[in-house]
């Protein structure tokens, strides 16, 4: 039975040209995290495998930095980066847990962070 929950940074906003940290955290389970995949709609951003290290997709290589931890730093933001991002936790023996983050990239300097929320 899957008992874990994923806590994410929730709905967040950031300024065009700036950077943002995408972060998820898996709690309430003793399952071992073997890998975390980061995806945006229909494409892969990155994979962090506990043993094999990081994979950064070539389309994001210049703008994505691994970490902190299992998170991902997205740099040089453009308005095209607005949208949904998913962290997919591969765990043993539970299986996969998915968290969702919505990022809005703003032209102005009034970007504010949204509240944290949980996805069971």
């Amino acid at each position: 039975m899957m008992t874990g929950t994923i806590e994410t940074t929730g709905n967040i906003s950031a300024e065009k040209g700036g950077s943002i940290i995408l972060q998820c955290h898996l709690s309430s389970t003793t399952a071992q995290v073997t890998q975390v995949n980061w995806e945006q709609q229909d494409q892969l951003l990155a994979i962090c495998n506990a043993d094999l290290g990081w994979h950064i997709s070539p389309s994001f290589k210049d703008r994505v930095a691994p970490g902190p931890g299992l998170g991902l730093t997205l740099q040089s933001l453009t308005v095209n980066d607005t949208g949904e991002y998913f962290c997919i936790y591969h765990t043993y023996p539970d299986g996969t847990y998915t968290g969702r983050i919505f990022l809005e990239v703003l032209e102005s300097s009034v970007a504010e962070h949204g509240a944290r929320f949980q996805i069971p």
Epitope: T34, D42, N49, D51, L52, G53, H55, P58
Partner: antibody, heavy 119, light 107 residues
Framework: QVQLVQSGAEVVKPGASVKISCKTS????????MHWVKQAPGQRLEWIGG????????RNNQKFKGRATLTVDTSASTAYMELSSLRSEDSAVYYC????????????WGQGTLVTVSS | DIQMTQSPSSLSTSVGDRVTITCKAS??????VVWYQQKPGKAPKLLIY???YRYTGVPSRFSGSGSGTDFTFTISSVQPEDFATYYC?????????FGQGTKLEIK
């Protein structure tokens, strides 16, 4: 230039073990993960596992768990795979292959080592 | 484990023809797909990754596309040196898995 040179062909008896080496040159050994891939006659390629020479962490295909041991000697820039409790279906060509820096695509491969399990 | 199924398993074609190979994953693999070429007695060679980027030195006649579960590999105009076996592979989750291969033969 990047090179991966594997040890020579082996003929081994069922139940025995074999240890294959993969000597690398032309790049910083600790920066790239090393993988091992099996190709039995007429079969698809099969990923055995990978090892990160920098931290020693390795991930194995459960199918080979307990029988395939991946190790590295960083001072010699060499990766090893030991396969134990050999059976006839282990007869195959085994390749080492390196994946890129922060990239999982296997961009350089060794020439392959033929292992024949026969009594 | 994620199963990768290629079609067709073999293909007879002529020099200059356009060839398309498909690869279907048993579950979502996003864009974590790679294509290799292998000639008899030789190690596989990386051609396409992620899944539309040509590896260094790979001719422009080779291309790839797809996302999710369905992927395509195309040779726009087959050359004599292209007769070989082609494999797709996913690295979305371990164990990494390969398709069964597509053998490109001379008609």
């Amino acid at each position: 230039q990047v090179q991966l040179v594997q040890s020579g062909a082996e003929v081994v008896k069922p139940g025995a073990s074999v240890k294959i080496s993969c000597k690398t040159s032309g790049y910083t050994f600790t920066e790239n993960t090393m993988h091992w891939v099996k190709q039995a006659p007429g079969q698809r390629l099969e990923w055995i596992g990978g090892i990160n020479p920098n931290q020693g962490g390795n991930r194995n295909n459960q199918k080979f768990k307990g029988r395939a041991t991946l190790t590295v000697d960083t001072s010699a820039s060499t990766a090893y795979m030991e396969l134990s409790s050999l059976r006839s279906e282990d007869s195959a060509v085994y390749y080492c292959a390196r994946s890129g820096l922060r990239d999982y695509a296997m961009d350089y491969w060794g020439q392959g080592t033929l292992v024949t399990v026969s009594s | 484990d994620i199963q990768m199924t290629q079609s067709p398993s073999s293909l007879s074609t002529s020099v200059g023809d356009r060839v398309t190979i498909t690869c279907k994953a048993s579950q979502h693999v996003s864009t974590a797909v790679v294509w290799y070429q292998q000639k008899p007695g030789k190690a596989p060679k990386l051609l396409i990754y992620s899944p539309s980027y040509r590896y260094t030195g790979v001719p422009s006649r080779f291309s790839g596309s797809g996302s999710g579960t369905d992927f395509t590999f195309t040779i726009s105009s087959v050359q004599p040196e292209d007769f070989a076996t082609y494999y797709c592979q996913q690295h979305y989750s371990t164990p990494w898995t390969f398709g069964q291969g597509t053998k490109l033969e001379i008609k």
